[in-house]
Amino acid sequence: CDLPQTHSLRNRRALILLAQMGRISPFSCLKDRHEFRFPEEEFDGHQFQKTQAISVLHEMIQQTFNLFSTEDSSAAWEQSLLEKFSTELYQQLNDLEACVIQEVGVEETPLMNEDFILAVRKYFQRITLYLMEKKYSPCAWEVVRAEIMRSFSFSTNLKKGLRRKD
């Protein structure tokens, strides 16, 4: 399971696509900035084992995939870029799932991470709530796009965990 290299390559491609997806100038959206509280302190203060890192990364990518697979998202972004971005995320999910099976075994599920997974879910709930409150405005989506890019690059400790032998 050569995850570190493939994941980092796919991650970079996803970030490039996300960067290209902007439709309006973010300069007009300063007043829409919002504190989503990505749980970076929890992540930074923890040494993730490989299986833990895989399951938390899987949750982050799954939640991002869900967020960008909604009808509201389809209306907000250029369709071909959105499709490429979603495909990239879907392939990352497949890579991670294949790794989980290889690392843990088919039957076993890494449940030692429930707190981290819950933190990720709550974070995405805050993002979804913000979009709803802002009525899925173009600026709200711009702010969310910037936030997702930031959270993707914040998950360095998780990526370190991918390189660790359990």
Partner: antibody, heavy 121, light 107 residues
């Protein structure tokens, strides 16, 4: 360590052109915007404009629109401020500073050391 | 453009004094306000962002408060290194604008 390093002091004559630089290091250059701020001798801070190095999108203060050009070369993590025809009133210290864009993070948390531009005949 | 007005424009104080600087915006800026400190010949340094968040590495004697149009920077016990010029800046919309500055001098 995050650093913004600006080019050295310049002495120019009125009518001459000039391009000063601001090189970022220790962070992802395209993840932050770069703003430019002017401080005339003995005066306060004036925001001139800003650039998103990821796509070179720019915004200017109306006071500086058409007077200066802000650009960036992301391949070398450098932002620029340029004049095509300097005036004596352009004499000032010019600072670049890092801005988090739309992220909820401190504005202008790191600054360059400043570039002193003197325009005199 | 949003106008930012600081008061006073200068003040004299002694080491140990409690110092308060105010900043008023010409329209509501929610909590999108930053405070900077600048010493002669140096670049400005961020002290407070989003009206009340203390920037990493800044001593806890500095604090910020306010929202809407009225904001305050407080130095609870002035230290020798705090003699400088302080600027507020709104960050809710372009063009970004600074206050004219408040110079804190030794009494």
């Amino acid at each position: 360590e995050v650093q913004l390093v600006q080019s050295g002091a310049e002495v120019k004559k009125p009518g001459e052109s000039l391009k000063i630089s601001c090189k970022g290091s220790g962070y992802s250059f395209t993840s932050y915007w770069i703003g430019w701020v002017r401080q005339m001798p003995g005066k306060g801070l004036e925001w001139m404009g800003i650039i998103d190095p990821s796509d070179s999108d720019t915004a200017y203060s109306p006071s500086f629109q058409g007077q200066v050009t802000i650009s960036a070369d992301k391949s070398i993590s450098t932002a620029y401020l340029q004049w095509s025809s300097l005036k004596a009133s352009d004499t000032a210290m010019y600072y670049c500073a890092r801005h988090p864009g739309l992220n909820w993070a401190p504005d202008f948390d790191y600054w360059g050391q400043g570039t002193l531009v003197t325009v005199s005949s | 453009d949003i106008q930012m007005t600081q008061s006073p424009s200068s003040l004299s104080a002694s080491v140990g004094d409690r110092v308060t600087i105010t900043c008023r915006a010409s329209q509501s800026i929610a909590e999108f306000l930053n405070w900077y400190q600048q010493k002669p010949g140096k670049a400005p340094k961020l002290l407070i962002y989003f009206a009340s968040s203390l920037q990493s590495g800044v001593p806890s004697r500095f604090s910020g408060s306010g929202s809407g149009t009225d904001f305050t920077l407080t130095i609870s016990s002035l230290q020798p290194e705090d003699f400088a010029t302080y600027y507020c800046q709104q960050s809710i919309d372009f063009p970004l604008t600074f206050g004219q500055g408040t110079k804190v001098e030794i009494k």
